[in-house]
Amino acid sequence: IFLSAFFTYVPMNEQIIIGRLGEDIILPSSFERGSEVVIHWKYQDSYNSYNVHSYYKGSGRLESQDTRYANRTSLFYNEIQNGNASLFFRRLSLLDEGIYTCYVGTAIQAITNKVVLKVGVFLTPMMKYEKRNTNSFLICNVLSVYPRPIITWKMDNTPISENNMQETGSLGPFSINSTLNITGSNSSYECTIENSLLKQTWTGRWTMKDGLHKMQSEHVSLSCELVNDYFSPNQDFKVTWSRMESGISSILAYYLSSSQNTTFYESRFSWNKELKNQSDFSMNLTDLSLSDSGEYLCNISSDEYTLLTIHTVHVEPSQETASDN
């Protein structure tokens, strides 16, 4: 009996692999170990087939490799003898999306595995609060995202649709701004951006607190709590306190959870260490002056959430100061 005459046919397997733009990925392929191993990874589009990586006669063969894959692919050469034909793919680009076939031939069989590669990107979005003249706006912004995300807004937990969307990047990655006019409103707002491919969701929440009326020389406590519903215990986050003045934001304090470092840019600003340990980032501003009147913004941000809390502080002259005038 000539064993070489008996060849096993294995139907084409298909796997979907999801990678991130700029990162590395492994396209998996395995086979029943055997001698005389030949591996051909190819990329298939509607019209052509492109050589991605080949291996035969005991070494990688890149003479006919398509230039777009140069220095970006390799096999696990030490693992081939164990049946591993997986491709290590470096620095993914959106153009790498598509169908890859891995042909593996040995002395006794040939198989073809199909891998569908999808590439996504989701740079952490931001929620910004802006004042333009007498108008107030909330902007949800994602600098780089692919594929197009689903963006939803809620006002007091009720979905709303009236927002202004701007998009750049015709083929992707996209840069998207979604703007909501919230002039005169003291409702809470929530913006959610979802990348369905990467199964990643980011939520920005904006809350306007009741206005605080204080007298000159007094101190004020501005509340800002990290809500456990939003943040998991081991998640890194940052807290920024800033002041909005004539549409310009100036930072007052900054805290980084990963290093537990706090930086103050205003000497009259402080927070209670005890409260901070309980994820309460409420601030004290002492020795108030008339010029301290305005909007104070607390921003707690992680990869998945941004919580914006706005306080409006009105500082009024004390009686002594009033009678001096």
């Epitope: 005459a5 060849f7 046919y9 030949v38 051909h40 006669k57 006919s64 002395a107 040939a110 073809t112």
Partner: antibody, heavy 121, light 106 residues
Framework: QVQLVESGGGVVQPGRSLRLSCAAS????????LHWVRQAPGRGLEWVAV????????YYADSVKGRFTISRDNSKKSLYLQMNSLRAEDTAVYFC??????????????WGQGTLVTVSS | DIQMTQSPSTLSASVGDRVTITCRAS??????LAWYQQKPGKAPKLLIY???SLESGVPSRFSGSGSGTEFTLTISSLQPDDFATYYC????????FGQGTKLEIK
Amino acid sequence: QVQLVESGGGVVQPGRSLRLSCAASGFTFSDYGLHWVRQAPGRGLEWVAVIWYDGSEEYYADSVKGRFTISRDNSKKSLYLQMNSLRAEDTAVYFCARDRNSGALGYFPHWGQGTLVTVSS
Amino acid sequence: DIQMTQSPSTLSASVGDRVTITCRASQSINNWLAWYQQKPGKAPKLLIYKASSLESGVPSRFSGSGSGTEFTLTISSLQPDDFATYYCQQYNSYSTFGQGTKLEIK
């Protein structure tokens, strides 16, 4: 079992063309590279051309480059050799041979019985 | 192009003899060498690949050795069925055959 059957040979005048075919059975045709090898009467073997499993690559011996074209139709499980500008020195038995796998290895566990091409005026 | 030179061109031997055929490459071909047996009017038959690997179904009296540029095919004990022409083939770079060695009965 693997079977390769060549056809299309015959007598042809110098400068004319001929097309050889090789019908395959007994294996998954689209998984294997295929070669043409020839043997002039009373002489040794000469490799002519190879085409890879998916038709993506083809290579030729210098003696036939630019005159012969190897092709395949995976749906018909057939291999072809289009021979143009034939010369007397192309007279030979033409064998269809299957590569060990994709075509990249270049040796032949399976052969057809051959078809004779005679180039003569 | 890589040239393959076989020696001898003709070899006379008797049943039971141990015979050796040599094949020399014009440049190193690592171990990418195959040996074939061909009988008159028939297609060649693969005996050895990768210089020393025995193709399945081929009797163990056939063996191959060598690497680089020098290779040998050995038949340890000639059988009546072994009288034929033997070809070496390099497949390091495309493919080239040796001119053949005719093994005939003494």
